[in-house]
């Protein structure tokens, strides 16, 4: 039995074609015979040589499913057949090709077409009677709609489109169709006439024209100023450029691919010259004024200001200001001088007339008739006269004239007339300048000479009287010198408060009572007059020790006795015990701590009368003595 | 009328690659397609691949896929094709040449001869 | 890849005879298909497109028929200036597409 063709299997498939792939089976035959059902249901037969192993069905419909039978042959024997079952691939199609808005240039196109993932849509775009003209655009494969514009007026197109699907192109689709005819212009005006431009505007159907042709002629002479081509989407253009107080006319024409329109046309006439005016010169200073003027609200480019001493016209200077201003100020100037200021504006390079004002500067501000006054130890106040408004501030250097090198300035408001000078020593010759600061000025200097008064005589601080409790404070004063005197008393170890005593002027001295026997004081005097307080006087002073008591003799014996005494109140250091015969002879001396109130002498002559002195000692400081005698046994 | 001038001839070794360009004047470069075409000596016409400039994407003969490179530079007009891994049955005149609608190749560069030899 | 068999490969005739060269395809190109001549040293020129249609310039002399797999190229009379190598090229393939192998037109 003949065997069966192996692996039979389709390898390609396209549109129309099916490509089959066999293997030869192992037993001998003399041919093969390949049948296949159409879609009509009827079988085709074709024979094929032995060696045959691949065949291309060929013609076939796209998109339809065909059954595929292969037998060997050998004689009337045949194997059983080998099957297999393929379909073509569908043609991706087309369909409805609708040509939209034949607007008068352009050409909207729409078109279906299945769901295949296509590359691209090509489309030739071609006039009917000139196939010449034709026009390629590849379109990305996800659009339906393609818009052609710049096409010509009025004129039949043939318009075909195919698709690109799997590498491969769809059949061509075609239409043909007419662009409309030229649509007219609206009407046109002019706005915004100057002296030297103006503003078209005209109207028209949106997208019809590419350009605009706009020719200006001036009037009188017919002669063609300006030849203007502009952009179809505009509806208006400005006309820079022009002459003044001159006629025009207007023509404008719309422009497509291929066409122009018929032209509209305006007539204008242009506005007068610009000019200046209300030239006015206000706050006129000393050294300085303000120009004022006025003109229309055109862009002036710059405006140029002339300023010359009206006796000196070489002495002249310009000034140009930007063109958005209507006042300048001019510094700079002489003070009480005559002057001439001219101003003309410069507007599309063109210059208006020249305007001139005549106006006299101020005179130069001044500072006079500087005065001292209210002359005390410490200060005195000055005053002057100013021209008024005219002062940022005024400078007062102050010299003493002792030390020159050393100054004071002090800076006022330039209101101020009036100053008060303090913190000045008594006695004491000064040289004081004034200046005036205006903004573009300082004054010539002015000066004068003041002196401060002498500070009243307060002198010879002397203490007396000293005693342990306290002392006497006395001094010297200038008679009706002053108000009242501070005397103060502070103990040299700062350990107590002072004490403060105030007296009236005409007092000299001071008795201190209830201070502290044995210690060191100061004192201070100073005097008040006028609210001032002089420099105090300084005095160092200790109250005395305070001396012991009440002197006893008792246990006298030939060549001994025992002295006592009461201590003094305030603590000392020790007490010393001088003892003598009365008829002469060398003092004996002892000496005991501050804490003992008695001691013994020893080493007396018997019957003798002997003179005993006590002291109390505190450092370098002795008590007054205290004395007694007694006679020895 | 359109143009295509293409760049001088080139001799190369086995193993390299050349780039060749094609500069279009006269017409819209970036909305038609640029196919290039080889003839080696005493040869028919065989196509390479092309390119549609407005999208920059390429299609290539299944004989050239992976070897061949089709580019284009809108800003210049210009196409290149760069061929790699040259062997010596690449000798040949290589055509630039625009299609028309249907696909036709109606405008055709000079031809630029790469030689391929050791 | 669609391939393309032109047949004759060469073809010998005199000044006004009537030529046709055939071309076919390996499947259905419905009638996406070119014709071009050729001669020694020399670029391709367009002749036919779309299998049928004349390219602005060449003479009327030529004519294309044909659609699905089996195209002709007819010169209606032979003239001096047509004696050229003659190619075939499918453009079902998109951007265009394979050749034939060319037919060869030479003088008797």
């Known amino acids: 039995e003949l065997d069966t063709p192996k692996d039979l299997q389709v390898s390609e498939t396209a549109e129309t074609s099916l490509t089959l792939l066999w293997k030869t089976p192992l037993a001998k035959f003399d041919r093969y015979r390949l049948n296949y059902s159409l879609p009509t249901g009827q079988w085709v037969g074709v024979q094929l040589p032995r060696n045959t192993t691949s065949y291309v069905l060929r013609g076939l419909e796209p998109g339809q499913e065909y059954n595929v039978l292969l037998t060997a042959e050998k004689g009337r024997h045949k194997s059983k057949p080998a099957r297999v079952k393929a379909s073509t691939e569908e043609v991706p199609s087309l369909e409805n090709l609708t040509v939209t808005e034949a607007g008068w240039d352009g050409l909207r196109l729409n078109w279906t077409a299945d769901d295949l993932a296509y590359e691209y849509f090509v489309i030739q775009v071609q006039e009917a009677n000139n196939v010449e003209t034709a026009h390629n655009f590849t379109v990305p494969g996800n659009l339906r709609a393609a818009d052609i514009p710049g096409l010509k007026v009025a004129t039949s197109y043939r318009v075909s489109i195919y698709g690109v699907a799997r590498g491969y192109r769809t059949p061509v689709l075609s239409a043909e169709t007419s662009t409309g005819t030229t649509p007219n212009l609206g009407e046109v005006t002019v706005a915004e006439v100057g002296w030297d431009a103006l503003t078209l505007n005209w109207t028209a159907p949106e997208g019809a024209y590419k350009n605009f042709f706009i020719q200006v002629l001036e009037a009188d002479t017919t002669q063609t100023v300006q030849n203007l081509t502009v952009p179809g989407g505009l509806r208006s253009v400005d006309l820079p450029g022009l002459k003044a107080a001159t006629r025009y006319y207007i023509t404008l024409r719309g422009v497509t691919q291929d066409f122009g329109t018929a032209p509209l046309s305006v007539e204008v006439l242009t506005e007068d010259l610009p000019q200046l005016g209300g030239l006015s010169v206000t706050e006129v200073s000393w050294d300085g004024l303000t120009l004022n003027w006025t003109t229309d609200d055109l862009a002036y480019k710059h405006f140029v200001v002339q300023v010359q001493e009206a006796n000196n016209v070489e002495a002249a200077q310009n000034l140009t200001v930007p063109g958005s201003l209507r006042a300048v100020d001019i510094p700079g100037l002489k003070a009480d001088t005559p002057y001439r200021v001219s101003i003309y504006g410069v507007i599309q390079g063109y210059r208006t007339p020249m305007l001139s004002t005549d106006v006299s500067t101020a005179r130069e501000p001044e500072i006079g008739n500087l005065n001292v006054s209210d002359v005390t130890p410490k200060s005195f106040n000055l005053s002057w006269t100013a021209t008024d408004g005219i002062f940022d501030m005024f400078t007062i250097e102050i010299i003493d004239s002792n030390r020159l090198l050393q100054t004071a300035e002090h800076n006022i408001s330039g209101a101020e007339r009036t100053a008060h000078i303090s913190g000045l020593p008594p006695s004491t010759d000064f040289i004081v300048y004034l200046s005036g600061i205006a903004p573009s000025i300082r004054t010539k200097t002015i000066s004068t000479t003041a002196t401060t008064e002498a500070l009243p005589l307060l002198e010879n601080l002397t203490i007396s009287d000293t005693n342990p409790y306290g002392f006497t404070v006395s001094w010297t004063a200038s008679e009706n010198a002053f108000d009242s005197f501070l005397v103060t008393v502070v103990d040299s170890g700062k350990l107590l408060d002072p004490q403060e005593f105030t007296l009236s002027g005409t007092q000299r001295k001071l008795e201190l009572r209830g201070l502290i026997t044995g210690i060191g004081y100061e004192v201070l005097v100073s005097g008040f007059t006028q609210g001032h307080q002089t420099k105090p006087l300084r005095a160092e002073t200790i109250t005395a020790m305070g001396s012991p008591k009440e002197v006893i003799f008792s246990d006298i014996t030939e060549n001994s006795a025992t002295v006592s005494w009461r201590a003094p109140t305030a603590q000392v250091e020790s007490f010393r015990i001088t003892y003598v015969p009365i008829t002469g002879g060398t003092p004996s001396m002892v000496t005991v701590d501050g804490t003992k109130t008695q001691t013994r002498l020893v080493k007396l002559i018997p019957g003798v009368e002997y003179l005993v002195s006590i002291i109390a000692m505190k450092g370098f400081e002795e008590s007054e003595p205290v004395s007694g005698s007694f006679t020895t046994a | 009328q359109v143009q295509l001038v293409q760049s001088g001839a080139e001799v190369k070794k086995p193993g390299s690659s050349v780039k060749v360009s094609c500069k279009a004047s006269g017409g819209t470069f970036s909305s038609y397609a640029i196919s290039w075409v080889r003839q080696a000596p005493g040869q028919g016409l065989e196509w390479m691949g092309g390119?549609?400039?407005?999208?920059?994407?390429?299609n290539y003969a299944q004989k050239f896929q992976g070897r061949v490179t089709i580019t284009a530079d809108k800003s210049t007009s210009t196409a290149y094709m760069e061929l790699s891994s040259l062997r010596s049955e690449d000798t040949a005149v290589y055509y630039c040449a625009k299609g028309n609608f249907y696909g036709g190749l109606d405008y055709w560069g000079q031809g630029t001869t790469v030689t391929v030899s050791s | 890849d669609i391939q393309m068999t032109q047949s004759p490969s060469t073809l010998s005739a005199s000044v006004g005879d009537r030529v046709t060269i055939t071309c076919r395809a390996s499947q259905s190109i419905s009638s996406w298909l070119a014709w071009y001549q050729q001669k020694p040293g020399k670029a391709p020129k367009l002749l036919i497109y779309?299998?049928?249609s004349l390219e602005s310039g060449v003479p009327s002399r030529f004519s294309g028929s044909g659609s699905g797999t089996e195209f002709t190229l007819t010169i209606s009379s032979l003239q001096p200036d047509d004696f050229a190598t003659y190619y075939c090229q499918q453009n079902k393939k998109f951007p265009s597409g394979t050749f034939g192998q060319g037919t060869k037109v030479e003088i008797k």
């Open positions: 390119i549609i400039p407005i999208f920059g994407t390429a």
């Open positions: 779309d299998a049928s």
